[in-house]
């Protein structure tokens, strides 16, 4: 059962730095065995992998989202699977990896001036109406009055980060900019290659923390360009 | 800041039940899917169960499944976790998480904020 390996690859005598304990996150790394993993149309081994289970999208990583392991998905538990590359089957928007989305069926690019369109022109439509979406967890409910007095929380709306909180930033969450907190050394960032090129992010990441800077992870300097991790690094 | 206080764990005989409690602070409680998770004595962390945001949706691991059964009250920002039937194998210290979600490239247990834990021992 998926169950068995989700028990099986628990990680070994982790200690308790890694824990994300009192309210914060862990480190990146995951030090559990090799197990399968399911990305695109084949399940491939991916070494220091733990499956995650999942309710939503938006509690995967930025390349995975959240189905059951299993064709045709019973209600059981689901899991963050790897997201889908290009010209992959898709049924929705965050089963693509970033850089895509989801059109008729199938991952294409989303680099392309009519989607980039798309994209800002929601964003526009939803800050003129007290109707709009808060973010990627709540697409599907209104805000309340209740929120508007979170303001500047980790998740409230916001228009620039100014309207944030010490430790967040304002980025943007599928149709929507919330605050977000700042990233912490070691975690993922993302380095823009050309100038313009966040403004086709669904899942806006903030910036690095003061004194790190967004830098290739050394042990990454290896793989091809397009798959470089990226983590927020001391100067 | 993100904070996660758990309470109600102790001593129980095996049978026995208990009810834990998180509270929550520091986020918007009611948009986010919520979990316990519990990591025995020298062991890794293991997922126990899973909520969503409204509450409607729930999942558990099969080792708990029929004894233990999680709850929120997004008015009061608790998460709970009712214990039935617990055996001595359920001994561990338990925390309620909640997913960093899009900071990461890939999702992992101990990438989530998460409280102090709680302790629950099973033993006569």
């Known amino acids: 059962t998926l169950n068995s390996v989700l028990n099986s690859n628990a990680i070994k005598n982790l200690p308790p730095p890694l824990g994300g304990a009192a309210g914060h996150p862990g480190s990146a790394v995951s030090a559990a065995p090799g197990i399968l993993y399911p990305g695109g149309n084949k399940y491939q081994t991916i070494d220091n992998y733990q499956p995650y289970p999942c309710a939503e999208d938006e509690e995967c990583g930025t390349d995975e989202y959240c189905a059951s392991p299993t064709r045709g998905g019973d209600a059981g538990v689901q899991i963050c699977l790897a997201c889908r590359k290009r010209r992959k089957r898709c049924m929705r928007h965050a089963m693509c990896c970033p850089g895509n989305y989801c059109k008729n069926g199938i991952c294409v690019s989303s680099d392309q001036n009519h989607f980039r369109g798309e994209i800002e022109e929601t964003i526009t439509e939803s800050f003129g109406n007290d109707h709009s979406t808060l973010d990627g967890y709540s697409r599907r409910t209104t805000l309340s009055s209740k929120m508007y007095h979170t303001k500047g929380q980790e998740g409230s709306v916001c228009l620039r980060s100014s309207d944030c909180a010490s430790g967040l930033c304002c980025a943007r969450h599928f149709w929507s900019k919330i605050c977000k907190p700042v990233l912490k050394e070691g975690q993922v960032c993302t380095k823009h290659r050309r100038k313009g090129s966040h403004g086709l992010e669904i899942f806006q990441r903030c910036y690095c923390g003061e004194g790190l800077s967004c830098r290739i992870q050394k042990d990454h300097h290896q793989a091809s360009n397009s798959s470089r991790l990226h983590t927020c690094q001391r100067h | 800041e993100v904070q996660l206080v758990e309470s109600g764990g102790g001593l129980v005989q095996p049978g026995g039940s208990l009810r834990l409690s998180c509270a929550a602070s520091g986020f918007p409680f009611s948009i986010y899917p919520l979990k316990w998770v519990r990591q025995a004595p020298g062991k890794g962390l293991e997922w126990v169960s899973h909520?969503?945001?409204?509450?409607?949706?729930?999942m558990y691991a099969d080792s708990v499944k029929g004894r233990f059964t999680i709850s929120r009250d997004n008015a009061k920002n608790m998460l709970y976790l009712q214990m039935n039937s617990l055996k001595p194998e359920d001994t561990a210290v338990y925390f309620c998480a909640r997913s960093a979600g899009k900071v990461v490239s890939r999702a992992s247990l101990e990438n989530d904020y998460r409280g102090q834990g709680t302790q629950v021992t099973v033993s006569s």
């Open positions: 909520i969503s945001r409204d509450g409607g949706r729930t």
